[in-house]
């Protein structure tokens, strides 16, 4: 059967590709270490916003995360342009130390697998997806109850490196990178009337840092 | 290699619609947005609207809303612009342009529209 | 909606010349600047992403610089391949807008 030829043909050259990746591959390295900085393109895709806690000043938030960057030692030539991969793979290659500024707690889903995405395109360009739910801190005054406006942040960047090794960009510029998805709002009491997104570096005692910003702005009803 | 080819020249007649496609190699346009650009001739560039192909979320500047649909087919890896009611004005070449890497990064040929009785 | 401003249409260079183009934003833009490269036969490129950042295959001789609303594209040694006309584009805030555009000749 030529089908069944061309599939274990196929199946044989996936193999050998990511064998060939692998091979000599040091993943607590970051890709352009001691040549450039690594730059990760990131975007949200808010598929629930809420609940909204007053007493707790926090929010519950599910998004998909999607990060893009590129790995010069992740090249290669093949029949096929791109590489699908499972979540096993991820823990083979660089990926970013992104964590939650502003985040309580981080929930990664695993049901009935770990919901991660990894793709790898033949010029090394990866993109990494996962599905998160995140219970983040959100200060709100209060002094304006019932007529009160507030705006909650999700707050994210590199654990361990500084600006000058990592350095994060809105995938969609500053306009169009987090989206809320039409029937997102898991609101009661409150409007969520928009959001907007930016950047700020953070200096403490082991450098600068970026944190990327989202801000949802929401309102009482 | 990363490559958008568009559809190619339209020469259609006042009122008529007409629909332009891109069609993507070497990535998945599910990883990215696709962007549709209005060039007039001897002018600069316009932003018509954008689709994001994997939950086909569409954001079009408010001059080009009514005027423009843009859709996406996942499993063609192509991106689509309809244009209807047409005017002279509406002639102009239309390029499709993808977002990689936070800009329009792999831009199509360009499709020329001639509207025209 | 941003504007974008070129203020220079034109640009007559020679070959080996350094040329610089600038553009500037009604606002500020936080550094979310792009420019597109437009040749003759309509065909476009992005060369520089996030003000200075050289898109894959770019030559080494482009360079982007600015900050706030003031951005300029700089080509170091001007070659015949150069010859097109230049947009800058930002992407702060939506719509995008792109710049009306620099044309660079051969003097």
């Known amino acids: 059967n030529i089908q069944e030829d061309e599939a274990k043909n196929n199946i044989t050259i996936f193999t050998r590709i990511l064998d060939r990746l692998l091979d000599g591959y040091d993943n607590r390295l970051r890709p352009g270490l001691g040549d450039s900085i690594t730059e990760v393109f990131t975007n949200i895709y808010v598929t629930s916003f809420g609940p909204v806690s007053d007493t707790d000043m926090e929010y519950t938030i599910d998004v998909f995360f999607r990060q893009k960057w590129k790995d010069e030692r992740l090249k290669f030539k093949g029949p096929m342009n791109i590489l699908r991969l499972n979540n096993l793979m991820a823990s083979k290659i660089w990926t970013p130390d992104t964590f939650f500024h502003n985040g309580k707690k981080s929930v990664a889903h695993n049901m009935t697998m770990p919901n991660k995405l990894l793709r790898i395109q033949d010029d090394g360009t990866l993109l990494y997806t996962m599905r998160l739910t995140v219970q983040a801190e959100c200060p709100m005054h209060l002094e304006d109850f019932p007529m009160d406006a507030h705006s909650c942040p999700l707050k994210f960047g590199s654990y361990a490196y500084t600006t000058s090794e990592v350095t994060y960009i809105w995938t969609y510029n500053a306009s169009d990178s987090v989206q809320v998805a039409p029937d997102g709002s898991r609101l009661n009491q409150y409007d969520l009337l928009g959001q907007s997104i930016g950047k700020e570096t953070i200096k403490s005692s082991t450098g600068e840092y970026t944190v990327m910003t989202a801000h949802f702005h929401l309102k009482r009803k | 290699e990363v490559q958008l080819q568009q559809s190619g020249a339209e020469l259609v007649k006042p009122g008529a619609s007409v629909k332009l496609s891109c069609t993507a190699s070497?990535?998945?346009?599910?990883?990215?947005?696709m962007y549709w650009v209005k060039q007039r001739p001897e002018q600069g560039l316009e932003w018509i609207g954008r689709?994001?192909?994997?939950?086909?979320?569409?954001k079009y500047d408010p001059k080009f809303q009514g005027k423009a649909t843009i859709t996406a087919d996942t499993s063609s890896n192509t991106a689509y612009l309809q244009l209807s009611s047409l005017t002279s004005e509406d002639t102009a070449v239309y390029y499709c342009?993808?977002?990689?890497?936070?800009?329009?990064?792999?831009w199509g040929q360009g499709t020329t529209l001639t509207v025209s009785s | 909606d941003i504007q974008m401003t070129q203020t220079t249409s034109s640009l007559s260079a020679s070959l080996g010349d350094r040329v610089t183009i600038s553009c500037r934003a009604s606002?500020?833009?936080?550094?979310?600047l792009n420019w597109y490269q437009q040749k003759p036969d309509g065909t476009v490129k992005l060369l520089i992403y996030?003000?200075?950042r050289l898109h894959s295959g770019v030559p080494s001789r482009f360079s982007g610089s600015g900050s706030g609303t003031d951005y300029s594209l700089t080509i170091s040694n001007l070659e015949q391949e150069d010859i097109a006309t230049y947009f800058c584009?930002?992407?702060?805030?939506?719509?995008?807008?792109f710049g009306g555009g620099t044309k660079l000749e051969i003097k």
């Open positions: 070497g990535f998945n346009i599910k990883d990215t947005y």
């Open positions: 606002q500020d833009i936080s550094n979310y």
């Open positions: 689709i994001d192909p994997a939950n086909g979320n569409t």
């Open positions: 342009a993808s977002n990689y890497y936070g800009s329009f990064d792999y």
């Open positions: 584009q930002q992407g702060n805030t939506l719509p995008p807008t």
């Open positions: 996030y003000t200075s």
